[in-house]
Interface confidence: medium
Amino acid sequence: MMTGTIETTGNISAEKGGSIILQCHLSSTTAQVTQVNWEQQDQLLAICNADLGWHISPSFKDRVAPGPGLGLTLQSLTVNDTGEYFCIYHTYPDGTYTGRIFLEVLESSVAEHGARFQIP
């Protein structure tokens, strides 16, 4: 039975050219996290595997950095980065949990960054 819940940074905004941290946190479960996948819409950005560490998709290597924790840092943001991002937690024995973050990249210099938190 899947008892866990995913907390995310929710809807966030950032400035064009800047960077942003995408964070998810899985709670209320004792399941072992075996892998976390980060996706933009349906494109794979990065994988953090419990054993093999991080794998960044080649097409995003220049603009995506692993961490902090199981989170993901997007750099050199463009307006085209606006959209949905998903953290997909593969766990054992629970199964798969998915969290959603909406990022809006603004031209303006007054973009407010959404609340961030670190994974303990």
Partner: antibody, heavy 120, light 107 residues
Framework: EVQLLESGGGLVQPGGSLRLSCAAS????????MAWVRQAPGKGLEWVST????????YYADSVKGRFTISRDNSKNTLYLQMNSLRAEDTAVYYC?????????????WGQGTLVTVSS | DIQMTQSPYSLSASVGDRVTITCRAS??????LNWYQQKPGKAPKLLIY???TLQTGVPSRFSGSGSGTDFTLTISSLQPEDFATYYC?????????FGGGTKVEIK
């Protein structure tokens, strides 16, 4: 050349044991998650087990849980499947396969298979 | 467990035909869907991963599409070497289940 070569199949009586081996060449086994997949005569493919990259996490189909054990010997670059308490329904060709990236990805390299027949 | 249902079970086609095979998941698997080709007596071969990405060395006449629960494998112009059985597989959640297979036969 990247290759997988299975061995160890054969005829065994119900309740018996068998250990399958899968020798890898052209890549380092410990850098990848690995899997076993089986195919009963004239039937489709059935995932059996996956071993994570470090060898620290194992996953099994319900049909083999508690009877089969997946493991690896890094020094021999070889993957194993120890099969105990074998049943007639375990009769199949057993393939070992490499997992592309992380543990939740496609099986990109397959061995030629080894036939296990469980019969009295 | 996530069930994968392929259709049709089998089909007859001629060289040059456009062939479409579908795969449906019992729940959303996003794009965690792979396609394999298997010829008699041989091991399966990966054709497409993550629903639409062609594995290196696979001819461009093969293509995949879909997301969520419904997926399609298309062979744009069937060649003699394409007569085989095709399987879909989900790797969204363990156990990593396969579809029942679709046998493509010569008409």
């Amino acid at each position: 050349e990247v290759q997988l070569l299975e061995s160890g199949g054969g005829l065994v009586q119900p309740g018996g044991s068998l250990r399958l081996s899968c020798a890898a060449s052209g890549f380092t086994l410990s850098s990848y998650a690995m899997a076993w997949v089986r195919q009963a005569p004239g039937k489709g493919l059935e995932w059996v087990s996956t071993l994570s990259g470090s060898g620290g996490s194992t996953y099994y189909a319900d049909s083999v849980k508690g009877r089969f054990t997946i493991s690896r010997d890094n020094s021999k670059n070889t993957l194993y499947l120890q099969m105990n308490s074998l049943r007639a329904e375990d009769t199949a060709v057993y393939y070992c396969a490499r997992v592309r990236v992380g543990a939740y990805d496609a099986f990109d390299i397959w061995g030629q298979g080894t036939l296990v027949t469980v019969s009295s | 467990d996530i069930q994968m249902t392929q259709s049709p079970y089998s089909l007859s086609a001629s060289v040059g035909d456009r062939v479409t095979i579908t795969c449906r998941a019992s729940q959303s698997i996003r794009r965690y869907l792979n396609w394999y080709q298997q010829k008699p007596g041989k091991a399966p071969k990966l054709l497409i991963y993550r629903a639409s990405t062609l594995q290196t060395g696979v001819p461009s006449r093969f293509s995949g599409s879909g997301s969520g629960t419904d997926f399609t494998l298309t062979i744009s112009s069937l060649q003699p070497e394409d007569f085989a059985t095709y399987y879909c597989q989900q790797t969204y959640s363990s156990p990593f289940t396969f579809g029942g297979g679709t046998k493509v036969e010569i008409k």
